[in-house]
Each structure stands twice: as structure tokens, then as C-alpha cells.
Interface confidence: medium
């Protein structure tokens, strides 16, 4: 079920924090844990039974303005011989992250959060068959 | 920052690149998709490298709700079902954005964090190291 | 599995009052805001009251101050809202709901109960 948007804000503010319009909150875009780095192992994309390759989505109103995302390089899996085998399925695995979007009204800019799905990379799955009866 | 393509029209005081701080509206876009894996798809079920997924929940962060992958083996499932440890299940992981609370009480003021979620497993072929 | 289940609605008379209850599973509950929305016939959905964590703060919509009032018992997952004075206009489907840390976000709520006020 979705729920619709409710226009009320009701929190009280302690006094030390920053003055908020009301419908609005404060984002510092300076990331925490900017530097950390991910650690996978090496070209698994390439070694992978179920093969990706990336592609960078630039977008100069969205924060962070770089988003990565994986496409499935076949429909199969690549078998011990190295050839397709279609009796099995690459799939896309995804996960949601936050951006930052920044729109133009006019002259006026406006900031919104966003959730994005991102396709991380693929893995490889025993189809689900469908008998016709 | 980040370069912003700009109304000629509009005044040149306006900031070419992201400030540092934004005021954001507090709706946002998209947040009702389906956030929950196992309800999304059986992939970690069908998998050649399957995986559990842990829910790692904090309270003070946004979502609240986050879920890990973890590899169910170290080798893959063949065509027999059987664990194959000539191939590896190896975890994909992925940067994301959340919102933390800050200042920590402030229920108006955030900040994004980034942090390191693995999301699923896939099988890869291991790296031979031959010993001289 | 997250559940939030309502109970207590029902038929009462202009002036009347009701309790609802809410009982969660499936999360912290002592560590989560918790929040009553509703639901008018033909309305859109509106905020009622709100709950801290440990229940030293509430927050409520002006419309209901003075006549509804909020409570939890973390011990029993428990969220309550005692209704008073009950108006024909607070006719509506009352949901539970489990708050984010952004204010007026939920990410779970439950299937309402019904609050009916006629004569």
C-alpha cells in the first residue's frame, strides 16, 4: 500500500539546531565515510559464471552526479567450457541508494532526495519454468 | 562541486555547484518502492551462489532498515546440487547513501553517510596462484 | 516479518470515547517513534498524534489536543490512543504506523480500524 503525502511537520527543536522552514529538513552533502573504499574481489565481473559490464550515468542535477550501473552481458551463464549455457539465467541483483536531485523552477532551485535503484552486477539462477497445461 | 547548466537568464549570483548544505523538501521521490528483497525476488534462493540476508537495522539512520547479503558457501551449487569448490561465491558489494541525524537529536537536520552493503553473491572462476 | 494490528474502533456517539490499540512484532519497537494517522472517507491521510521512543515526547495535530491523547508500554509493544470527546469529523480509519527518523515517514503500517462517530 502506498501512502499519500501528509503535509504537517510537529517536531520540536531543541535549541541548538538549525532553523528549519516548516515541510523541509537541513542536508549536509559533505558524505561521512567518503574514503572508504570497497574491497571486492578482483574483475568478478569478468570472472563471473554470470558476466557484467558497467556503465557511468552522469547527470549534472543529481548528487552524487556519477551513479554506476551493471548490465548482464548475457541471457545464459557461462558454463566450465566457457560457452553459453541458456539453461540457466543471468539476472540483475539491485539496491536502492539515496541522491540528491536539484531542479530548476523558473530561476528558483529546489533540492529533493531521491531513492535510485542501482544494478550492482548479475548472478546466475535456475530458471522458474512455467508448464502450459 | 558540481557543474549546474544555468538559465542565462537568471541572475549570475546563483551557484554553479552544489552547496555544501541544502535545505531538501522532506517528501521523497520514489521512497515507496519495494525495499525488501526476499519479497522482491527469489534470486538468493535460485542462485548458483546463494545467500542469506541479514537485517541490519538502525533506528538512527534512514533507511532503518537495511538488508545484508552473506554467501550460503564458499564453493557454487552445480548442475547436481552439490557444492562445486573448483568455483567461488563471491559477494557483490555496493556503495550506498543514507541520512544520519545530525546534530544527533535535531529531528530536522541530516547528513548522508556512505556506506558498504553486499547485496548478493555471484560465482566466479578463482584466481590460480602457482607456486614457483 | 514487521506487524502492526489495530483494534478497539467501532460505532460511538457524538461526545463518546474509544481506545485503540496497536500491537507491533517483528522490530524493536522500543526504539522506533510511533505514529497515529487516519484516514476520512473520500480524504486524503492525516497526521494525528506522534510518540518518542520512550515516550517523553508527544506531538499531536491541533485539530485532536485536549481530547486525544497517545501512550505506549514498550514492555508489551504496545501503542494506545485514547479517544474523548469524539466528534462526527473524527469519523475515519485510524492506522498505526512505525516511524523513520524523517518526520512524517513510515515505513510500516498496519490494515486501520474503523472509528465511526454518529448519532
Known amino acids: 500500500r502506498k501512502i499519500p503525502k501528509v503535509g504537517h511537520t510537529f517536531f520540536q527543536k531543541p535549541e541548538s539546531c538549525p532553523p528549519v522552514p516548516g515541510g523541509s529538513m537541513k542536508l549536509d552533502i559533505g558524505i561521512i565515510n567518503e574514503n572508504q573504499r570497497v574491497s571486492m574481489s578482483r574483475n568478478i565481473e569478468s570472472r563471473s559464471t554470470s558476466p557484467w559490464n558497467y556503465t557511468v550515468t552522469w547527470d549534472p542535477n543529481r548528487y552524487p552526479s556519477e551513479v554506476v550501473q551493471a548490465q548482464c552481458r548475457n541471457l545464459g551463464c557461462i558454463n566450465a567450457q566457457g560457452k553459453e549455457d541458456i539453461s540457466m539465467n543471468s539476472v540483475p541483483i539491485q539496491q536502492e541508494t539515496l541522491v540528491v536531485r536539484r531542479k530548476h523552477q523558473g530561476c528558483s532551485v529546489s533540492f529533493q532526495l531521491e531513492k535510485v535503484l542501482v544494478t550492482v552486477g548479475c548472478t546466475c539462477v535456475t530458471p522458474v519454468i512455467h508448464h502450459v497445461q | 562541486g558540481i557543474t549546474i547548466p544555468r538559465n542565462p537568464g537568471c541572475p549570475n549570483s546563483e551557484d554553479k555547484n552544489f552547496p555544501r548544505t541544502v535545505m531538501v523538501n522532506l517528501n521523497i521521490h520514489n521512497r515507496n518502492t519495494n525495499t525488501n528483497p526476499k519479497r522482491s525476488s527469489d534470486y538468493y534462493n535460485r542462485s548458483t551462489s546463494p545467500w542469506n540476508l541479514h537485517r541490519n537495522e538502525d533506528p538512527e539512520r534512514y533507511p532503518s532498515v537495511i538488508w545484508e547479503a552473506k554467501c550460503r558457501h564458499l564453493g557454487c551449487i552445480n548442475a547436481d546440487g552439490n557444492v562445486d569448490y573448483h568455483m567461488n561465491s563471491v559477494p557483490i558489494q555496493q556503495e550506498i547513501l543514507v541520512l544520519r541525524r545530525e546534530p544527533p537529536h535535531c529531528p530536522n537536520s541530516f547528513r548522508l553517510e556512505k556506506i558498504l552493503v553486499s547485496v548478493g553473491c555471484t560465482c566466479v572462476t578463482p584466481i590460480v596462484h602457482h607456486v614457483a | 516479518e514487521v506487524q502492526l494490528v489495530e483494534s478497539g474502533g467501532g460505532l460511538v456517539q457524538p461526545g463518546g470515547s474509544l481506545r485503540l490499540s496497536c500491537a507491533a512484532s517483528?522490530?524493536?519497537?522500543?526504539?522506533?517513534?510511533m505514529y497515529w494517522v487516519r484516514q476520512a472517507p473520500g480524504k486524503g491521510l492525516e497526521w494525528v498524534a506522534n510518540?518518542?521512543?520512550?515516550?517523553?515526547?508527544?506531538y499531536y495535530v491541533d485539530s485532536v489536543k485536549g481530547r486525544f491523547t497517545i501512550s505506549r508500554d514498550n514492555a508489551k509493544n504496545s501503542l494506545f490512543l485514547q479517544m474523548n470527546s469524539l466528534r462526527a469529523e473524527d469519523t475515519a480509519v485510524y492506522y498505526c504506523?512505525?516511524?523513520?527518523?524523517?518526520?512524517?515517514?513510515?515505513?510500516?503500517w498496519g490494515q486501520g480500524t474503523l472509528v465511526t462517530v454518529s448519532s
Open positions: 517483528g522490530f524493536t519497537f522500543s526504539s522506533y517513534s
Open positions: 510518540i518518542k521512543q520512550d515516550g517523553s515526547e508527544k
Open positions: 504506523a512505525k516511524g523513520e527518523i524523517l518526520p512524517l515517514h513510515f515505513d510500516y
